[in-house]
Interface confidence: medium
């Protein structure tokens, strides 16, 4: 968890992560996205518990599959190439959870679609931000 002296910086990072996740969600939910049906067939692991920054480990472990699914989408739906976007998200996740943190992620039994996955992590960001403000 961030020290009290870095709360604001942490909140900014969370807001950046939130924006990127929302941008992905908006991009794939775009009515012009012909690959949406195909994208929804991919399954993502959901965290059993996601209430602290260390739980971002579960998001980090799913970034590679997320990038692979995004490669299916038309690039014009996104401001960035999937590789750059995921790299950006990865850096923010590392800063937030701390690269020295060793946390074993526990996943829920049920898998989820990309839309459910993104909504879960968007909710996580919003929840942590609300506790920081």
């Amino acid at each position: 968890a961030p020290t009290s002296s870095s709360t604001k910086k942490t909140q900014l990072q969370l807001e950046h992560l939130l924006l990127d996740l929302q941008m992905i969600l908006n991009g794939i939910n775009n009515y012009k996205n012909p690959k949406l049906t195909r994208m929804l067939t991919f399954k993502f692991y959901m965290p059993k518990k996601a209430t602290e920054l260390k739980h971002l480990q579960c998001l980090e472990e799913e970034l590679k599959p997320l990038e692979e699914v995004l490669n299916l989408a038309q690039s014009k739906n996104f401001h960035l190439r999937p590789r750059d976007l995921i790299s950006n998200i990865n850096v923010i996740v590392l800063e937030l959870k701390g690269s020295e943190t060793t946390f074993m992620c526990e996943y829920a039994d049920e898998t989820a679609t990309i839309v459910e996955f993104l909504n879960r992590w968007i909710t996580f960001c919003q929840s942590i931000i609300s506790t920081l403000t």
Epitope: K8, K9, L12, Q13, E15, H16, L17, V91, I92, E95
Partner: antibody, heavy 126, light 112 residues
Framework: QVQLVESGGGVVQPGRSLRLSCAAS????????MYWVRQAPGKGLEWVAV????????YHGDSVKGRFTISRDNSKNTLYLQMNSLRAEDTAVYYC???????????????????WGQGTTVTVSS | DIVMTQSPLSLPVTPGEPASISCRSS???????????LDWFLQKPGQSPQPLIY???DRASGVPDRFSGSGSGTDFTLKISRVEAEDVGVYYC?????????FGGGTKVEIK
């Protein structure tokens, strides 16, 4: 360990050009905004330019606008400052600095800096 | 452009005593996200500037807790609760809200 190393400074005549480089290591360069800040001898700090993490936005200070250009090569982890039409008042130590917060920021971009290089000296004199 | 005004210009201090530096901006640095986009830096003699405070009051990594930042809108203060010899140098405030980024003129802290 995050490190920024500037190079390319030196003595140059007025009206000539110079290109400064800043080699970055120890962090994911492509995810951070980068800055140039200068300090004239015995004076305070003056912001020169900023470039967003992906190069999509570049801003320059009024005193260098139209003469200096900030750029970056994310594949080489290097930041540049192309300085043309140099003047005596451009004489300064030039520092590159790393953005404090990763990511895009978009509507609420925070222009904070958390790591600075050691600086490279540019002297414009005839 | 946002003008940053620092005072005092010079601050002679006694080790162990508190010190305070003021920074005023020509327009509010309070962003709609609730943060004050105001940073403090220290430049020790012969060195590059180093960050002290982000966003008005967040201490940068490794900065001792004797340093604190406060204020909102246009008026900000950097406080050192007990000055140590290693704290000498020039302190700068900077607005990180919009380009052109602007710095205060600096406050030179020296031991009496």
């Amino acid at each position: 360990q995050v490190q920024l190393v500037e190079s390319g400074g030196g003595v140059v005549q007025p009206g000539r050009s110079l290109r400064l480089s800043c080699a970055a290591s120890g962090f994911t360069f492509s995810s951070y905004g980068m800055y140039w800040v200068r300090q004239a001898p015995g004076k305070g700090l003056e912001w020169v330019a900023v470039i967003w993490y992906d190069g999509s936005n570049k801003y320059h200070g009024d005193s260098v606008k139209g003469r200096f250009t900030i750029s970056r090569d994310n594949s080489k982890n290097t930041l540049y400052l192309q300085m043309n039409s140099l003047r005596a008042e451009d004489t300064a130590v030039y520092y590159c600095a790393k953005g404090a917060v990763a990511g895009t920021g978009r509507d609420y971009y925070y222009y904070g800096m958390d790591v600075w290089g050691q600086g490279t000296t540019v002297t414009v004199s005839s | 452009d946002i003008v940053m005004t620092q005072s005092p210009l010079s601050l002679p201090v006694t080790p162990g005593e508190p010190a305070s530096i003021s920074c005023r901006s020509s327009q509010s640095l309070l962003h709609s996200n609730g943060f004050n986009y105001l940073d403090w830096f220290l430049q020790k003699p012969g060195q590059s500037p180093q960050p002290l405070i982000y966003l008005g009051s967040d201490r940068a990594s490794g900065v001792p807790d004797r340093f604190s930042g406060s204020g909102s809108g246009t008026d900000f203060t950097l406080k050192i609760s007990r000055v140590e010899a290693e704290d000498v140098g020039v302190y700068y405030c900077m607005q990180a809200l919009q380009t052109p980024l602007t710095f205060g003129g600096g406050t030179k802290v020296e031991i009496k």
